[in-house]
Interface confidence: medium
């Protein structure tokens, strides 16, 4: 079948990195500079992606594969094939429609990306709050109040309306 097809269509013999040139009697011509063909039998070569602005080149374009981009420091990739670069935020922040915003009360983010997550609700596991949470750090849960020896103290958890876990995720 392959041989029959190649007799019918000379373009099927053109390997990746070339294109079937109709202007030159359907002979296989190398892809011009800044273009590529990743499969055989193509009648045109695709233009290489150019990594400009906040994009930087992660992998150079070759005659058989497209360039790959990532983002400059302070930005990170979003979308398939790094189609967008978005700014990093600071710890204790998250990216919103209006840019980087501090985590709301009751939530934290210990990374430069990701979203603000709710503080762990220690009471759900019958434990007490040993160390209060911040915008950058989760609460640390300690032993249950009953396990604490007399005189031992534990940080008082926030009031019920502001209980850890009652804030945006």
């Amino acid at each position: 079948f392959e041989r029959t097809r190649s007799l019918q269509d000379p373009c099927s013999n053109c390997p990746a990195g070339t294109f079937c040139d109709n202007n030159r009697n359907q002979i296989c011509s190398p892809c011009p500079p800044n273009s590529f063909s990743s499969a055989g039998g193509q009648r045109t070569c695709d233009i290489c992606r150019q990594c400009k602005g906040v994009f930087r080149t992660r992998k150079e374009c070759s005659s058989t594969s497209n360039a790959e981009c990532d983002c400059t420091p302070g930005f990170h990739c979003l979308g398939a094939g790094c189609s967008m670069c978005e700014q990093d935020c600071k710890q204790g922040q998250e990216l919103t429609k209006k840019g980087c915003k501090d985590c709301c009360f009751g939530t934290f983010n210990d990374q430069k990306r990701g979203i603000c997550r709710p503080w762990t609700n220690c009471s759900l596991d019958g434990k007490s709050v040993l160390v209060n949470g911040t915008k950058e750090r989760d609460v640390v849960c300690g032993p249950s109040p009953a396990d604490l020896s007399p005189g031992a103290s534990s940080v008082t958890p926030p009031a019920p309306a502001r209980e850890p876990g009652h804030s945006p995720q």
């Epitope: 978005e86 209006k98 945006p168």
Partner: antibody, heavy 121, light 110 residues
Framework: QVQLVQSGAEVKKPGASVKVSCKAS????????MHWVRQAPGQGPEWMGV????????TYAQKFQGRLTVTRDTSSSTVYMELSSLRSEDTAVYYC??????????????WGQGTTVTVSS | SSELTQDPAVSVALGQTVRITCQGD??????ASWYQQKPGQAPRLLIY???IRPSGIPDRFSGTDSGNTDFLTITGAQAEDEADYYC?????????????FGGGTKLTVL
């Protein structure tokens, strides 16, 4: 590929409890938070709660606090949702759904097939 | 607690463009995620963030926003797009819940 496989349908009497399992495969179980969402017949989805499989920390919707318990078993990559004191209005399809924040943006990208829970006397 | 509001039903002629809306206070801060659900199936994520599609989602689905409203646009609706569509976002309310869903929009393709 990434998959969430839930336990089978349940029929329960009012006042009873139900425990639904959700087994994850195809990714690092502890790296993604897991939500539970239910959907009553003819209604939209309703968020119930979330667990961080890494720490076991949970957060529940106010509506379900006191009745809902979400746990996980890291050795089997399974999350469990237990709902107690069942009433007829708890009749719904219960879904587990993986939380993928895609660096900055929230979305539930993989869902279990759903477990039908019927509460009837 | 805040809510996400959707039109209950929308119809579109085959091949035409339709826009489904989702309104809520939390959308001033966060982008909505959009899900498609067909009868007997689990919801499927279509759009998240600033108009980002997971792999396998056709490019006729797109997301935009304005103020406290996010939009799902289907350009060139196909028969297989007939389904329920739900928006979803995180909540900015200091109380529960942490995750919100809209009531859903039933799309009919004529």
């Amino acid at each position: 590929q990434v998959q969430l496989v839930q336990s089978g349908a349940e029929v329960k009497k009012p006042g009873a409890s139900v425990k639904v399992s959700c087994k994850a495969s195809g990714y690092t179980f502890t790296s993604k938070w897991m939500h539970w969402v239910r959907q009553a017949p003819g209604q939209g989805p309703e968020w119930m709660g979330v667990i961080n499989p890494s720490s076991g920390g949970t957060t529940y919707a106010q509506k379900f606090q006191g009745r809902l318990t979400v746990t996980r078993d890291t050795s089997s990559s399974t999350v469990y949702m237990e709902l107690s004191s069942l009433r007829s209005e708890d009749t719904a399809v219960y879904y587990c759904a993986r939380d993928d924040v895609f660096d900055y943006y929230f979305g539930l990208d993989v869902w279990g097939q759903g477990t039908t829970v019927t509460v009837s006397s | 607690s805040s809510e996400l509001t959707q039109d209950p039903a929308v119809s579109v002629a085959l091949g035409q463009t339709v826009r489904i809306t989702c309104q809520g206070d939390s959308l001033r801060r966060y982008y909505a995620s959009w899900y498609q659900q067909k009868p007997g199936q689990a919801p499927r994520l279509l759009i998240y963030g600033k108009n980002i599609r997971p792999s396998g989602i056709p490019d006729r689905f797109s997301g935009t926003d304005s103020g406290n409203t996010d939009f799902l646009t289907i350009t060139g609706a196909q028969a297989e797009d007939e389904a329920d569509y739900y928006c979803n976002s995180r909540d900015t309310d200091a109380n529960q819940p942490l995750v919100l869903f809209g009531g859903g929009t039933k799309l009919t393709v004529l």
